[in-house]
Interface confidence: medium
Amino acid sequence: AITEAREEAKPYPLFPGPLPGSLQTDHTSLLSLPHTSGYQPALMFSPTQPGRPYTGNVAIPRVTSAGSKLLPPLAFKHTVGHIILSEHKDVKFNCSISVPNIYQDTTISWWKDGKELLGAHHAITQFYPDDEVTAIIASFSITSVQRSDNGSYICKMKINNEEIVSDPIYIEVQGLPHFTKQPESMNVTRNTAFNLTCQAVGPPEPVNIFWVQNSSRVNEQPEKSPSVLTVPGLTEMAVFSCEAHNDKGLTVSKGVQINIKAIPSPPTEVSIHNSTAHSILISWVPGFDGYSPFRNCSVQVKEVDPLSNGSVMIFNTSASPHMYQIKQLQALANYSIGVSCMNEIGWSAVSPWILASTTEGAPSVAPLNVTVFLNESRDNVDIRWMKPLTKRQAGELVGYRISHVWQSAGISKELLEEVGQNNSRAQISVQVHNATCTVRIAAVTKGGVGPFSDPVKIFIPAHGWVDHAPSSTPAPGNA
């Protein structure tokens, strides 16, 4: 370590010889103290004579009695001004001051860069009393200095509410360059220029920067820190780092990977979660995003049917969540489903295709030619219909649902009957006389209940009347 000591002429000699604990320029014999910050205040013994200093940075004591000599102005003795040393070395420096015994409650505190150093045990204050003055030496030691110890240290002494401040002692801890800004990983567009920044500081300065790409130096001549590297463009992933050099040696930054944005990989694991007659709920696991966020996805659906025209239905959806309800599908049909996702570069390939089926649907048409007769002798209503022309997708007919509503003065009640798929007629008991009966019929499959036929009404008179209602929906060709 190098030590620069600044000496100036002193107007008043404080001590006849060197003080104990003065600066050791070789830093070899130091106090063995823990590395914490702070100070230990020193309290003077109560002097015999009272006294009050003048205000100001230097306190000039009054004459205490006739014939007594003038005491020197109170000021810290000049000491070393600048200490330069390497990281992890030990250092000790001190402030010294000679204080007339007339002053009471004298404390010395250490300050660094304007902040008081509190609560540490590596500051020590020693007292050397004489007849009229007490020499005070405040020592500060740091073991294994770090960059954070760099700064300006001063001593402050308070005497009767007055403050005396020492000259600063500058500690400069030198070491390998220290990065304040390192290059960052980036995802860049292929063949597009981008910048990387590297900044390192000493001391010692200057710090010079070399850039390294994939283990090879980019610049033959170093650049002074900070350095910005403009890369004209990459066609493939590369790793960049920077080397920071100063007189103490070299520090290498972290290596950062520069990825090239590319098309995503195809999604995987397309799964079917739920199928209904007209919809299928799917999910997928997104592929690698190509170092560029997914924008959206496309669900492609092909009907697997030799008679279909092979056209592909495309449903666009957001990239997240990785789920989509495919709607508007035919019932009881087989589909092949694939998913592709895109980022700013382009579309991924399609995922592996998976097969999925919709379930049976409910019938889409109502039974035809619904007719209603009153069978007065048996006191029931005779209902007849024709089987609806259902599509294969509606699934297998399992029966019919008959709704009959009875309305008379102030009364209305609906009843439902279920009959088997082989029936095309049914009889229902008369519920109320002197009332209107409204009949509707729907076909039923495993997929659900189809639409009801148009209502057919018949009036149920008091006994002795007969009424007949025409069919509600004419059979094809009879219109």
Partner: antibody
């Protein structure tokens, strides 16, 4: 569907040059590289280089620098490879292949290959 | 450049047999960067497996891939007559892109 259609077989004399073509269809031409791969009779596959249709940039295998030149005609979605100063060592089947590039590199579609015979 | 060494160079197998082909890289290749191709006689190569273990579209499930670092393998669970071909590994990590010399699979 994705297709890479290559030009027909070529018979050329030593010292001459030749230009092979590869017409792409069924996808966005500018999104993917077109690569060229050499296969000598009974031998393995050797990567020659790629061309990136979005900006025309190229990347060559050092071994083929000066031997092969990759170019494009984006209006017709066609990639070309010129081969110069031909010798019998250049007799081979040359494939074009679409480069699927997502920070790793593989060839997801291939042309049918063009047979080049260099003979006097 | 990364050199890929395949073994065996040629092999004969009967239908139903399990086949394993290995590919060794001269320096470490992340598993994301190792791919396999199948080339049948008189045809262009076809992508078989990408990223070490992902089957390309339309490839039967009897094919599988595994490995990491410098050691990779391609397995055919049960050999079929249509699998007669030459199989190549390829690394997509470092330019120049390189292929293995190939493994020729024949029918016993």
């Amino acid at each position: 569907q994705v297709q890479l259609q290559q030009s027909g077989p070529e018979l050329v004399k030593p010292g001459a040059s030749v230009k092979l073509s590869c017409k792409a269809s069924g996808y966005s031409f500018t999104t993917y590289d077109i690569n060229w791969v050499k296969q000598r009779p009974g031998q393995g596959l050797e990567w020659i280089g790629w061309i990136y249709p979005r900006d025309g940039s190229t990347k060559y295998n050092e071994k083929f620098k000066g031997k092969a030149t990759l170019t494009l005609d984006t209006s017709s979605n066609t990639a070309y490879m010129g081969l110069h100063s031909l010798t019998s060592e250049d007799s081979a089947v040359y494939f074009c292949a679409r480069g699927y590039y997502d920070n790793l590199y593989y060839f997801d579609y291939w042309g049918q290959g063009t047979t080049l015979t260099v003979s006097s | 450049e990364i050199v890929l060494t395949q073994s065996p160079t040629t092999m004969a197998a009967s239908p139903g047999e399990k086949i394993t082909i290995t590919c060794s890289a001269s320096s470490s290749v992340s598993s994301n960067y190792l791919h396999w191709y199948q080339q049948k006689p008189g045809f262009s190569p076809k992508l078989l497996i990408y990223r070490t273990s992902n089957l390309a579209s339309g490839v039967p499930a009897r094919f599988s891939g595994s490995g990491s670092g410098t050691s990779y393998s391609l397995t055919i669970g049960t050999m079929e007559a249509e699998d007669v071909a030459t199989y190549y590994c390829q690394q997509g990590r470092i330019v120049p892109l390189t292929f293995g010399a190939g493994t020729k699979l024949e029918l016993k």
